[in-house]
């Protein structure tokens, strides 16, 4: 699987999950989240050659098409597969609230 | 929705479904499909700016991150959303077989 265990410990050039730290204020302009100040969101990057963790029958077809037509702009793209929630603290007035923001952290990628 | 109805009738530059015809022999090297000889597979293409048909909370975060960090390689990607099957005819010996190949045709796209 193209997950953090594999991707973070390898020098994989093809589609894989990469490390990305996002600071809520600096990178998003969000001031409403009190904690954490930022988080390891990660992101997906890398080419999607034929047979590389392809998502659907269509992804296989498109990767094979791309192999036969190297100059074509049609190609599968490396996108998130497994996403995890992020617990946050924010304030409503002076009262702290804890909430889970769903689908915030990329754990693995796929070619779609 | 970024579907064929909207995308094929507009000059949309952002993420949208685009027309693509795939010839099974020429483009994929497949000789086993008797009919059709090819089909309109379509593909997804175009940038994914903030608020443009974003798939998950993560996609929104990444698009916003990209807006604040324009040079970053981390950005959402335009990928298939709705896929449709394709009926095909192939031969087993001299006997024709009809089958539906699932997830073969792109009907709409999303930013993931």
């Amino acid at each position: 699987a193209l997950d953090t265990n594999y991707c973070f410990s390898s020098t994989e050039k093809n589609c894989c999950v990469r490390q990305l730290y996002i600071d809520f204020r600096k990178d998003l302009g969000w001031k409403w989240i009190h904690e954490p100040k930022g988080y390891h969101a990660n992101f997906c990057l890398g080419p999607c050659p034929y047979i590389w963790s392809l998502d659907t029958q269509y992804s296989k077809v498109l990767a094979l098409y791309n192999q036969h037509n190297p100059g074509a702009s049609a190609a599968p793209c490396c996108v998130p597969q497994a996403l995890e929630p992020l617990p946050i603290v924010y304030y409503v007035g002076r009262k702290p609230k804890v909430e889970q923001l769903s689908n915030m952290i990329v754990r693995s990628c796929k070619c779609s | 929705a970024l579907d064929t109805n909207y995308c094929f009738s507009s000059t949309e530059k952002n993420c949208c479904v685009r027309q693509l015809y795939i010839d099974f022999r020429k483009d994929l090297g497949w000789k086993w499909i008797h009919e059709p000889k090819g089909y309109h597979a379509n593909f997804c293409l175009g940038p994914c700016p903030y608020i443009w048909s974003l798939d998950t909370q993560y996609s929104k975060v990444l698009a916003l991150y990209n807006q604040h960090n324009p040079g970053a390689s981390a950005a959402p990607c335009c990928v298939p959303q709705a896929l449709e099957p394709l009926p095909i005819v192939y031969y087993v010996g001299r006997k024709p077989k009809v089958e539906q190949l699932s997830n073969m045709i792109v009907r709409s796209c999303k930013c993931s």
């Epitope: 204020r25 600096k26 001031k31 904690e35 954490p36 100040k37 617990p87 603290v89 | -």
Partner: antibody, heavy 117, light 102 residues
Framework: QVLLVQSGAEVRKPEASVKIFCKAS????????MNWVRQAPAQGFEWMGQ????????NYNGKFKGRLTLTADTSTNTAYMELSSLRSTDMAVYYC??????????WGQGALVTVSS | DIVMTQTPLSLPVTPGEPASISCRAS??????LAWYLQKPGQSPRLLIY???NLADGVPSRFSGSGSGTDFTLRISSVEADDVGVYYC?????????FGQGT
């Protein structure tokens, strides 16, 4: 490399005020929270507050509310901590420390504040 | 305020032996915990951030584990240079309180 250089030791009388500076270099000063922490003699640590130099936003430990003022000068990349109405229990080493990824990764060398009549 | 409780308060270890320090939070802090080492006359040095991540330049004999309320700092093989006071600190809403030190 990241460097936080603090002002020297200070001696103050009870009820006086003290203002300590922390000059930052080697990173984007405006886009990282700066924390202030103190350590009383032979004691543990006490978090006092933090400031975001980019917009001046602050979070204070309620224990110091009204006595503690955190400021930052982005033209000189310097953070300031001012504590007023000093008492003998405020005698401590005061540290500035950069906030990063659920931690304070770089600390100043500390500034000893002595409160004595 | 969240209360951080460290155990033990004192830990004599022979060089080459493993060591572990526990830190318990009075409420769920998820993975928002850091570990520091303070040597006499020095500022604290970050060892572990976000509960399990090794800070830059910290030897791999140090490791952190846990989430929620219970956390552990482990040293696989103690060296003479590891002497000092170890502190945990949470980062789950201000004030960011510390453990009392080991």
């Amino acid at each position: 490399q990241v460097l936080l250089v603090q002002s020297g030791a200070e001696v103050r009388k009870p009820e006086a005020s003290v203002k300590i500076f922390c000059k930052a270099s080697g990173y984007s000063f405006t886009s990282s929270w700066m924390n202030w922490v103190r350590q009383a003699p032979a004691q543990g640590f006490e978090w006092m507050g933090q400031i975001y130099p980019g917009d001046g936003d602050t979070n204070y430990n309620g224990k110091f509310k009204g006595r503690l003022t955190l400021t930052a000068d982005t033209s000189t990349n310097t953070a300031y901590m001012e504590l007023s109405s000093l008492r003998s229990t405020d005698m401590a080493v005061y540290y500035c420390a950069r906030h990063y990824d659920g931690s304070t990764d770089y600390w100043g060398q500390g500034a000893l504040v002595t409160v004595s009549s | 305020d969240i209360v951080m409780t460290q155990t033990p308060l004192s830990l004599p270890v022979t060089p080459g032996e493993p060591a572990s320090i526990s830190c318990r939070a009075s409420e769920n802090i998820y993975s928002n915990l850091a570990w520091y080492l303070q040597k006499p006359g020095q500022s604290p040095r970050l060892l572990i951030y976000a509960a399990t991540n090794l800070a830059d330049g910290v030897p791999s004999r140090f490791s952190g584990s846990g989430s929620g309320t219970d956390f552990t700092l482990r040293i696989s093989s103690v060296e003479a240079d590891d002497v000092g006071v170890y502190y945990c600190q949470h980062f789950w809403g201000t004030p960011y309180t510390f453990g009392q030190g080991t």
